[in-house]
């Protein structure tokens, strides 16, 4: 790869204009912050590829990295990649804008890194300070990256001298992830248990020999010593446990449990804690909310969801209608309780194909020996449109009428509809909606009826047409909020002689 | 020269609409979350909201979700709260802050407070 | 919603006395909880982050520790310009919430 000019480093003026140019044996890119920029790409009569990248009106915000690389690498015997880094001193840039990745430096060791503090002059004189501090920090500076070294977990802020003002970068965070050679880890039989019952925790470390385990726990603090028990998990090599076991549990015993390990030949250490609550008696609260009016659609499968806390483990019943529900043996009711997290419940009560006769007041019931909770909810079927009926009469007034019949749940409303050129329609026309408009030429009369039986509504609509003179096509479209349906008559004058 | 300035306050009949505009300066304003905390007379610091970098997150506490929205402007370096359906226990001095939220490490996420703060704006909402 | 409770609610004390606030948490939050300190007519000024780290430029004499449910700051020497409303702060899945305040006073 040839770049032109060939830098390293070059420094270009403010607002102005200048042309970059690479060349190679294969098709080649110029790539700027990871992507490609606009640029001229053409292939030579000698088999050479070029790519021109032209800046243009250039300001501070083009400093940086610039690369040359073949297009397609594959195929190739090295990823050949060329790098320019440009300077373009901007008075009216201070430093350049990081993103959140750089702000927020993070480590899992020792080790250096780069505070990537950069600004669009090489000449300027830049600085590392701690945030909020005066004193610049020893560290060595690159213009082209930012400052270099080992540092501490704090935050830090550049700064420089641009004319006569003092410019400060972002703040950069330094922090250090927690990674020991030990691993440890502490769990616990419960992390809830009632005033009486059994606490008892392990705390477990692999691969070391020698290891000495330290509990701290809330009895301790009162004087009150427990001995932990610790063994070696002898099915896999270098497991080894501690136990802490506390009987009888009292209200006081609640608290942060903490095994801290040490390893003393390399001086390492690590500690775990865990939070144990003691209850004076068990408890069962609701999580969330359920609305007091749930919906199911007619022949589809609804699943009804409670989430709750609880400890001990409770009983969990589902009524309808104050009737005890039971997965039926048809498979059109499930019920499930599942286990969520130690004291985190999840009830389900999925009614499969939901039928009419499913309607209803629903209430769960969770219980034990200690509290009960009880939620209640009305379940409403939703039944899909169906216009059942429409038909056209001629009345001896004159007039002509359409009715339209049809059901649905909730309460459908009625939408008609007409169009006059029977060949565009409805493909290249619109059909016009009717109702009782102001020009009397239809009247509308619509009556709903609830089924109690069926649980829906039923919607009967006559529209009365004063004076048909050519063929109309009537349209009555039933909507609510779980379909539509739509049927359509053809009304003709009386004068003529047939009828569609 | 790390700075946050609010604008907008004024008495507002209650179902009254407002705008606040909170204008950064001296940082990247694009590369921070962003805050709304405020504060009734006489109380305790209450947290309103809050807006990821490029707007994809928006978080508010329950007592104004619906009412109220959280926007932003990073061109401009402004950051807004449009608050509808005003009432009477809205009235407090409103600050905007920068929220320290680092990108997310794997499954963990991490939390640095909220360093800068605005001088705040005062709504009141009072008939 | 994550409730945090401070005590004491005002706190009468001397200067060069050793102050110490506590916050609770109503449920664990490892150790995301940041403490501020607010003057009056003034926007709050951050002192500690992630339980226990001090921000830059925080007098050393405040300290903050805790973790899960139980957090504390501690002031070791109180000085004459600590007198003010201290906060607590939770951070949970991008939420935020306040512990009511503590205000130290001079006695």
């Known amino acids: 790869l040839v770049v032109t000019p060939p830098g390293p480093e070059l420094v270009l003026n403010v607002s102005s204009t200048f042309v970059l140019t690479c060349s190679g044996s294969a098709p080649v890119v110029w790539e700027r912050m990871s992507q490609e920029p606009p640029q001229e790409m053409a292939k030579a009569q000698d088999g050479t590829f070029s790519s021109v990248l032209t800046l243009t009106n250039l300001t501070g915000l083009d400093t940086g990295e610039y690369f040359c690389t073949h297009n397609d690498s594959r195929g190739l015997e090295t990823d050949e990649r060329k790098r320019l880094y440009i300077f373009v001193p901007d008075p009216t840039v201070g430093f350049l804008p990081n993103d959140a990745e750089e702000l927020f430096i993070f480590l899992t060791e020792i080790t250096e890194i780069t505070i990537p503090c950069r600004v669009t002059d090489p000449q300027l004189v830049v600085t590392l300070h701690e945030k909020k501090g005066d004193v610049a920090l020893p560290v060595p500076y690159d213009h082209q990256r930012g400052f270099s070294g080992i540092f501490e977990d704090r935050s830090y802020i550049c700064k420089t001298t641009i004319g006569d003002r003092e410019v400060d970068s972002d703040a950069y965070y330094v922090y250090r992830l927690q990674v020991s050679s030990i691993n440890v880890s502490v769990n616990a039989v419960q992390t809830v248990v009632r005033q009486g019952e059994n606490i008892t925790l392990m705390c477990i470390v692999i691969g070391n020999e020698v290891v000495n385990f330290e509990w701290t726990y809330p009895r301790k603090e009162s004087g009150r010593l427990v001995e932990p028990v610790t063994d070696f998990l002898l099915d896999m090599p270098y497991h080894i446990r501690s136990i802490l076991h506390i009987p009888s549990a009292e209200l006081e015993d609640s608290g942060t449990y903490t095994c801290n390990v040490t390893e003393s030949v390399n001086d390492h250490q690590d500690e775990k804690a865990i939070n144990i609550t003691v209850v004076e008696s068990g408890y069962v609260r609701l999580l969330g909310e359920v609305g007091t009016l749930q919906f199911a659609e007619l022949h589809r499968s609804r699943t009804l969801q409670v989430v709750f806390e609880a400890y001990p483990p409770p009983t969990v019943l589902w009524f309808k209608d104050n009737r005890t529900l039971g997965d039926s043996s048809a498979g059109e009711i499930a019920l499930s309780t599942r286990n969520v997290s130690e004291t985190r419940y999840v009830s389900e009560l999925t009614l499969v194909r939901v039928k009419v006769a499913e309607a209803g007041h629903y209430t769960m019931r969770a219980f034990h020996e200690d509290a009960e909770v009880q939620l209640s909810f009305q379940l409403q079927i939703n039944v899909p449109v169906r216009v059942l009926e429409l038909s056209e009469s001629h009345p001896d007034s004159g007039e002509q009428t359409v009715r339209c019949r049809g059901r649905g749940m909730p309460q459908p409303n009625i939408i008609w509809s007409a169009c006059r050129d029977l060949k565009r329609c409805p493909r290249e026309l619109p059909p016009t909606l009717l109702g009782n408009s102001s020009e009397e030429e239809s009247q509308l009369e619509t009556n709903v009826t609830y089924w109690e039986e069926e649980q829906e509504f039923e919607v009967v609509s006559t529209l009365r047409l004063q004076h048909v003179d050519r063929p109309l096509s009537v349209r009555c479209t039933l909507r609510n909020a779980v379909g539509q349906d739509t049927q359509e008559v053809i009304v003709v004058p009386h004068s003529l002689p047939f009828k569609v | 020269q790390v700075q946050l300035v609010e604008s907008g306050g004024s008495l507002v009949q209650p179902g009254g609409s407002l705008r606040l505009a909170c204008t950064a300066s001296?940082?990247?304003?694009?590369?921070?979350?962003m805050s709304w905390v405020r504060q009734a007379p006489g109380k305790g610091l209450e947290w309103v909201a809050n807006?990821?970098?490029?707007?994809?997150?928006?978080y508010y506490v329950d007592s104004v979700k619906g009412r109220f929205s959280i926007s932003r402007d990073n061109a401009k370096k402004s950051l807004y709260l449009q608050m509808n359906s005003l009432r009477v226990e809205d009235t407090a001095v409103y600050f905007c802050?920068?929220?320290?939220?680092?990108?997310?490490?794997?499954?963990?996420?991490?939390?640095?407070?909220?360093?800068?703060w605005g001088q705040g704006t005062t709504v009141t909402v009072s008939s | 919603d994550i409730q945090l409770t401070q005590s004491p609610s005002t706190l009468s004390a001397s200067v060069g006395d050793r102050v110490t606030i506590t916050c609770r948490a109503s449920?664990?939050?490892?150790?995301?909880l940041a403490w501020y300190q607010q003057k009056p007519g003034k926007a709050p000024n951050l002192l500690i982050y992630?339980?226990?780290t001090l921000e830059s430029g925080v007098p050393s004499r405040f300290s903050g520790s805790g973790s899960g449910t139980e957090f504390t700051l501690t002031i070791s020497s109180l000085q004459p310009d600590d007198f003010a409303t201290y906060y607590c702060?939770?951070?949970?899945?991008?939420?935020?919430?306040f512990g009511q305040g503590t205000k130290v006073e001079i006695k």
């Open positions: 449920q664990s939050i490892s150790d995301w």
């Open positions: 001296g940082f990247t304003f694009s590369s921070y979350w």
């Open positions: 802050a920068r929220d320290l939220v680092p990108p997310r490490q794997g499954d963990y996420y991490h939390y640095f407070g909220m360093d800068v």
């Open positions: 702060q939770q951070y949970n899945s991008y939420s935020r919430t």
């Open positions: 992630k339980a226990s």
């Open positions: 807006i990821q970098q490029d707007e994809n997150e928006k």
